[in-house]
């Protein structure tokens, strides 16, 4: 399984996913998984650099770069 081409779209607002509101789109395997109970971010560990800056886009475009945007650490839903 492979994701589609990735574009760098800066800090665009996240586009809607093909998933229902209680689900998230897992980019590794390209399908929706339940995530409603697992959305709470953990505090960013001290000393860690900021996560790779990216913005959620349409699945076909996958994920681009958005400088300075913080990612939310999430339990490993897959």
């Amino acid at each position: 399984m492979r994701r589609g081409p990735r574009s760098l779209r800066g800090r665009d607002a996240p586009a809607p996913t093909p998933c229902v509101p209680a689900e998230c789109f897992d980019l590794l395997v390209r399908h929706c998984v339940a995530c409603g109970l697992l959305r709470t971010p953990r505090p960013k560990p001290a000393g860690a650099s900021s996560p790779a800056p990216r913005t959620a886009l349409q699945p076909q475009e996958s994920v681009g770069a958005g400088a300075g945007e913080a990612a939310l650490p999430l339990p490993g839903l897959l």
Partner: antibody, heavy 126, light 107 residues
Framework: EVQLVQSGGGVVQPGRSLRLSCAAS????????MHWVRQAPGKCLEWVAV????????YYGDSVKGRFTISRDNSKNTLYLQMNSLRDEDTAVYYC???????????????????WGQGTTVTVSS | EIVLTQSPSSLSASVGDRVTITCRAS??????LNWYQQKPGKAPKLLIY???SLQSGVPSRFSGSGSGTDFTLTISSLQPEDFATYYC?????????FGCGTKVEIK
């Protein structure tokens, strides 16, 4: 302390079966996807399998597909790897590892494996 | 399957040296590239995720860069505890794959 403690390795004859276990502690096991990764003596790391946090979906590397089964018991905080029809080339140190992800909007991005077990050795030999 | 090619396969360096390891992917993987350190008889340890993000607790002398197909792990000033084997790994698609490692040895 977050940790994964493995057991179940050993010496087994070709064609036989073995089950590996990985006991998790220090985190909410049922909220995390889990992997098995192996390393043959003097060789590269090889991804073996992954299982969803709830056990609903599983993926396997081509070399083990149809022979190995990944499973979990969230009530026991334990991950398993059932290895059937073992071959000489399955000889390796096997590691369990926790999936590391970030959420961006409604998208889950995969960032590798952030917690690893100590490894358990499986030797397939007649 | 995405193939990751690491270079060099081994290198000799001294304490205090700046060390650079490269990883090339057979197709674009955006920034979905992670780096691990492994010492003999031990499990791998995550150092860098998403090409350039430092994992919690990892010393700041480790850094990563790159995107697309070409990635670099840099150790700015090699310390005695850094002598180990380093692996890259892609988390862009299943099957997940690893490079075959770069062994950093004492000169």
């Amino acid at each position: 302390e977050v940790q994964l403690v493995q057991s179940g390795g050993g010496v087994v004859q070709p064609g036989r079966s073995l089950r590996l276990s990985c006991a998790a502690s220090g985190f909410t096991f049922g909220s995390y996807g889990m992997h098995w990764v192996r390393q043959a003596p003097g060789k590269c790391l090889e991804w073996v399998a992954v299982i969803w946090y709830d056990g609903s979906n599983k993926y396997y590397g081509d070399s083990v597909k149809g022979r190995f089964t990944i499973s979990r018991d969230n009530s026991k905080n334990t991950l398993y790897l059932q290895m059937n029809s073992l071959r000489d080339e399955d000889t390796a140190v096997y590691y369990c590892a926790r999936r590391f992800t970030h959420l961006r909007g409604q998208y889950i991005e995969d960032y590798g494996m952030d917690v690893w077990g100590q490894g358990t050795t499986v030797t397939v030999s007649s | 399957e995405i193939v990751l090619t690491q270079s060099p396969s081994s290198l000799s360096a001294s304490v205090g040296d700046r060390v650079t390891i490269t990883c090339r992917a057979s197709q674009s993987i955006s920034s979905y590239l992670n780096w691990y350190q492994q010492k003999p008889g031990k499990a791998p340890k995550l150092l860098i995720y998403a090409a350039s993000s430092l994992q919690s607790g990892v010393p700041s002398r480790f850094s990563g860069s790159g995107s697309g197909t070409d990635f670099t792990l840099t150790i700015s000033s090699l310390q005695p505890e850094d002598f180990a084997t380093y692996y890259c790994q892609q988390s862009y698609s299943i099957p997940l794959t690893f490079g075959c490692g770069t062994k950093v040895e004492i000169k």
